[in-house]
């Protein structure tokens, strides 16, 4: 309740997160023209990426373009990219939708289609749908530990969400354990009324709100966080212009003294931790 006699000030906060969990991924792997099932293990270093500010990212799905080399090749025949003669291809032109710089030549992409030759990382990335179901759908069972230190400088008061009495094996539950700062990712989605399995395919942005409503008067002292969760991106993926959340990164290596890379389009959940609240004292 609002105590008008108190002097209130906004919270100053710092956040640190640690994600834990292992995922086993089964996917089709093509080697020498033969497609077979490949199994791989993903640990924290494989699926999380350091982000700036109060955010962390968990990869839930991906599309790979393996063995790319910097050379000349036909660009991917996306809509409007096909050609029938060199006239359609402009030397030095960099189409924002393309993956390279045009050489001015129209060349065969496959048996039936021709596209402009580009100087690029080849073969150029194909426009593939994100795998369904998501490859790392088991990320639902990953957990994140959120460490949140807060400070009210005007009241010279500092505290944090993790208490010395806390059990390291607890899991947050709105009713049974509302002060546990270890969250199961699937539970975060459930609390927000979202389907993890569905969001994991294209990715998304989830908000973890930490609300501190602190009464710092000694006779009725209370300063503990309240956690709530809500989805922050546009959930109507069919209608939104660029659905979900994804980015590309590359792993570089040398093969027979030739620099190559594997391009990975990573889909996943960016978790934004939003800390707000006030501290009041007479």
């Amino acid at each position: 309740s609002d105590k008008l006699y108190q002097r209130k000030e906004p919270v100053i906060s710092s956040v640190h997160t640690k994600v834990k969990g292992i995922a086993e991924v089964t996917e089709n792997v093509t080697e020498g023209g033969v497609t077979k099932l490949g199994h791989s293990i993903f640990d924290t270093a494989d699926y999380t990426f350091p982000l700036q500010g109060n955010s962390f990212f968990v990869m839930t799905n991906y599309v790979k373009s393996e063995g790319q080399v910097q050379t000349l090749c036909p660009e991917y025949p996306r809509r409007g990219a096909q050609c029938s003669s060199d006239r359609r291809c402009k030397k030095g032109w960099m189409d924002p939708q393309s993956k390279g710089i045009q050489t001015g030549r129209c060349v065969p992409y496959d048996k039936t289609r021709k596209t402009c030759e580009v100087s690029a990382w080849c073969p150029t990335e194909e426009e593939k749908e994100a795998p369904r179901p998501a490859l790392l759908r088991s990320a639902e069972n990953f957990t994140v530990l959120i460490k949140n230190n807060i400070h009210f400088p005007g009241h010279n008061y500092t505290t944090r969400n993790i208490l010395p009495t806390m059990n390291g094996s607890c899991t947050f539950h709105k009713t049974w354990d509302p002060q546990c700062s270890i969250f199961r990712l699937g539970d975060i989605f459930q609390e927000a009324g979202e389907n993890f399995t569905e969001v994991a395919v294209q990715g998304g942005i989830m908000g973890i709100e930490i609300y501190w409503d602190c009464n710092l008067d000694s006779w009725s002292h209370h300063c503990r966080p309240r956690y709530s969760f809500r989805r922050l991106d546009d959930k109507n993926t069919d209608e939104s212009f660029v659905p979900g959340y994804n980015f590309r990164y590359a792993k570089y290596y040398k093969e027979n003294n030739v620099e190559k890379r594997t391009l990975i389009k990573a889909f996943g959940i960016r978790f934004d931790i939003l800390v707000f609240g006030t501290g009041g004292k007479f």
Partner: nanobody
């Protein structure tokens, strides 16, 4: 139908020369690679040519001995093999692919191959 047909193979003495041809029909190609496979060994990429600019690639073991050229009008590429060694003995085939340039065989053309035997 997309087809590639090799010719020019045969028996030659060590130090001798051969010229292999790879003729394409039913498609216009962009990159052609020459491959070889010796008995009990893996298929090895020997040379590639890019039709648009005529640039070529040769694997280290044949550099300075093998050259590749093209005749666009005839839809044919050639592999000139000089200073042949017994270890060059293999079945030589051409295909619309080049691993070195990360160009997969989307066109799907691959010849049956021609035998090259180098005697010592």
């Amino acid at each position: 139908e997309v087809q590639l047909v090799e010719s020019g193979g045969g028996l030659v003495q060590s130090g001798g020369s051969l010229r292999l041809s790879c003729a394409g029909s039913g498609f216009s190609y962009y990159i052609i690679g020459w491959f070889r496979q010796a008995p009990g060994k893996e298929r090895e990429e020997v040379s590639c040519i890019r039709v648009t600019d005529g640039s070529t690639y040769h694997t280290n073991s044949v550099k300075g001995r093998f050259t590749m050229s093209r005749d666009n009008a005839e839809n044919t590429v050639y592999l000139q093999m000089n200073s042949l060694k017994p270890e060059d003995t293999a079945v030589y085939s051409c295909a619309t692919e080049c691993q070195r340039w990360a160009y997969p065989n989307r066109i799907g053309a691959r010849g049956q191959g021609t035998q090259v035997t180098v005697s010592s």
